[in-house]
Interface confidence: low
């Protein structure tokens, strides 16, 4: 007889999860010699106690400690890139800027991208139907702790100059709601971190406007300069080009006479 | 050799607007910025607005804003200023320069100056 | 905007003797400063670039020191053609801005 099986309105875990977990996790180990010291059997069991058995709208921040332990990870200073609803450009970015770190370049963010995962209470299943939605259901859902719990870590632990990617063709470039707004802002260390500087995506051709000067980008400047930390914010006029540039800094179209790739 | 060869000297009653032209000449500035500087009789210089020609991107200092236009023309490597609603304040030699930098990040040094345009604002 | 304070406002040197120029920034401009020259009736001259590079064809005596929000520019060994006002520029954060300048004049 099937059970009943509580109903949520957000998708269910993706497929072969624990799989998929587990293949990252040797895979990210493999590729970054720092790492190699992780049993990766052991994440997965950290990952697994997090959120299996338990009620999918009461996680919490502590329930994901053990593997936040685990994968303790630092990056260097002036190294860290947040964004914010411009994933993809973002993540391009530092393939090619080798250097440069996202969330998703250190071990927990790369097990957990783009996938979803639930339990149920009292039973040792994974819910592949359904998941909690994070507004028609509740907040404190396993993915959605996950993520904050990850972006407090990673953004504690960030020094020197620190880079946020915004899409500035959303009408809100800074959204005080997502979770570099929510969480990532207001967990920058003032005693390590001079300066956030965001770079604003432009999203057309023919956009030249200032987006510096768009009001959320203000009132971002105005939360960080409170908490004694410099803001500075530059237009990235041309996506394609920014990253062609990025691959080929020496392209006489890029370069007009500044040989290195950025100021700090 | 790049050279930035500015209109003559101009004579504009106030109220009026003039209209300034910068011309490369030995080569394109399309990869640069090109920006405007001017300078009162005796006093220091002053930023008033860059355009980035290759994007047609162009942004002002805030004091300007609403009353200078800076153009580009690619083809004939020439750059404009135009300046409206004159007044006696705006009288100032105003330069052309050529900007050098990593235009992505819009951070430019100034390596190459036109010989600057006195407009002198007078009833 | 950033503000650019130059000191002093003049600075009275014997030719062949040291001058160092100062320029201050209300907020740090990493190394994105520039040191530019005028003579009268002339369009101001780069000199250094990055806080610290010389532009080309700037001789040696020229020289560039900072990063942040403390700059110096140092004229090794004062020459005639030297004698003219030296302007600092940030180009950190837009609206770029120049200090107020030091006139460098023959004591």
């Known amino acids: 007889v099937p059970r009943w099986r509580q109903q949520w309105s957000g998708s269910g875990t993706t497929s072969r999860f624990p799989e998929t977990v587990l293949a990252r996790c040797v895979k990210y180990t493999e590729v970054h010699p720092e790492m190699r010291h992780v049993d990766c059997q052991s994440v997965w069991d950290a990952f697994k106690g997090a959120f299996i058995s338990k009620y999918p709208c009461n996680i919490t921040e502590e329930d994901y400690q053990p593997l936040v332990k685990l994968g303790t990870q630092t990056v260097p200073c002036n190294k860290t890139l947040l964004w914010s609803r411009i994933k993809d450009l973002a993540h391009q970015f530092t393939q090619v800027q080798r250097d440069m770190f996202t969330l998703e370049d250190m071990l927990l963010g790369y097990l957990a991208d783009d996938l979803t995962w639930c339990g149920e209470f009292n039973t040792f299943e994974i819910n592949y139907q359904s998941c909690p939605d994070w507004r028609k259901d509740c907040s404190n859902n396993p993915v959605s702790v996950f993520w904050k719990t990850v972006s407090r870590r990673f953004a504690e632990t960030a020094c020197g100059v620190v880079h946020v990617m915004l899409n500035g063709s959303r009408s809100k470039i800074f959204d005080k709601n997502s979770t570099f707004g929510s969480v990532e802002v207001h967990n920058l260390q003032p005693e390590k971190v001079q300066a956030l500087e965001a770079w604003v995506i432009h999203g057309g051709r023919e956009d030249s406007r200032d987006l510096c000067q768009d009001p959320t980008i203000k009132e971002l400047e105005s939360i960080i300069s409170k908490r004694n930390i410099r803001f500075f914010c530059k237009n990235i006029y041309r996506p394609d080009k920014f990253l062609q540039c990025v691959k080929n800094p020496e392209d006489s179209s890029c370069l007009s006479g500044i040989h290195h790739h950025h100021h700090h | 050799q790049v050279q930035l060869v500015q209109s003559g000297a101009e004579v504009k009653k106030p109220g009026s607007s003039v209209k300034v032209s910068c011309k490369a000449s030995?080569?394109?500035?399309?990869?640069?910025?090109i920006g405007w500087v001017r300078q009162a009789p005796g006093q220091g210089l002053e930023w008033m607005g860059r355009?980035?020609?290759?994007?047609?991107?162009?942004h002002y200092a805030q004091k300007f804003q609403g009353r200078v236009t800076i153009t580009a023309d690619e083809s004939t490597s020439t750059a404009y200023m135009e300046l409206s609603s004159l007044r006696s304040e705006d009288t100032a030699v105003y330069y052309c320069?050529?900007?050098?930098?990593?235009?992505?990040?819009?951070?430019?040094?100034?390596?190459?100056w036109g010989q600057g345009t006195l407009v002198t604002v007078s009833s | 905007e950033i503000v650019m304070t130059q000191s002093p406002a003049t600075l009275s040197v014997s030719p062949g003797e040291r001058a160092t120029l100062s320029c201050r920034a209300s907020?740090?401009?990493?190394?994105?400063l520039a040191w530019y020259q005028q003579k009268p009736g002339q369009a101001p001259r780069l000199l250094i670039y990055?806080?610290?590079t010389r532009a080309t064809g700037i001789p040696a005596r020229f020289s560039g020191s900072g990063s942040g929000t403390e700059f110096t520019l140092t004229i090794s060994s004062l020459q005639s053609e030297d004698f003219a006002v030296y302007y600092c520029?940030?180009?950190?954060?837009?609206?770029?801005?120049f200090g107020q300048g030091t006139k460098v004049e023959i004591k």
């Open positions: 320069a050529r900007g050098l930098g990593y235009y992505l990040y819009s951070s430019y040094y100034f390596d190459i």
């Open positions: 030995g080569g394109s500035f399309s990869n640069y910025a």
């Open positions: 355009i980035i020609p290759r994007l047609d991107a162009e």
């Open positions: 907020q740090s401009v990493s190394s994105n």
């Open positions: 990055g806080a610290s």
């Open positions: 520029q940030q180009y950190n954060n837009w609206p770029w801005t």
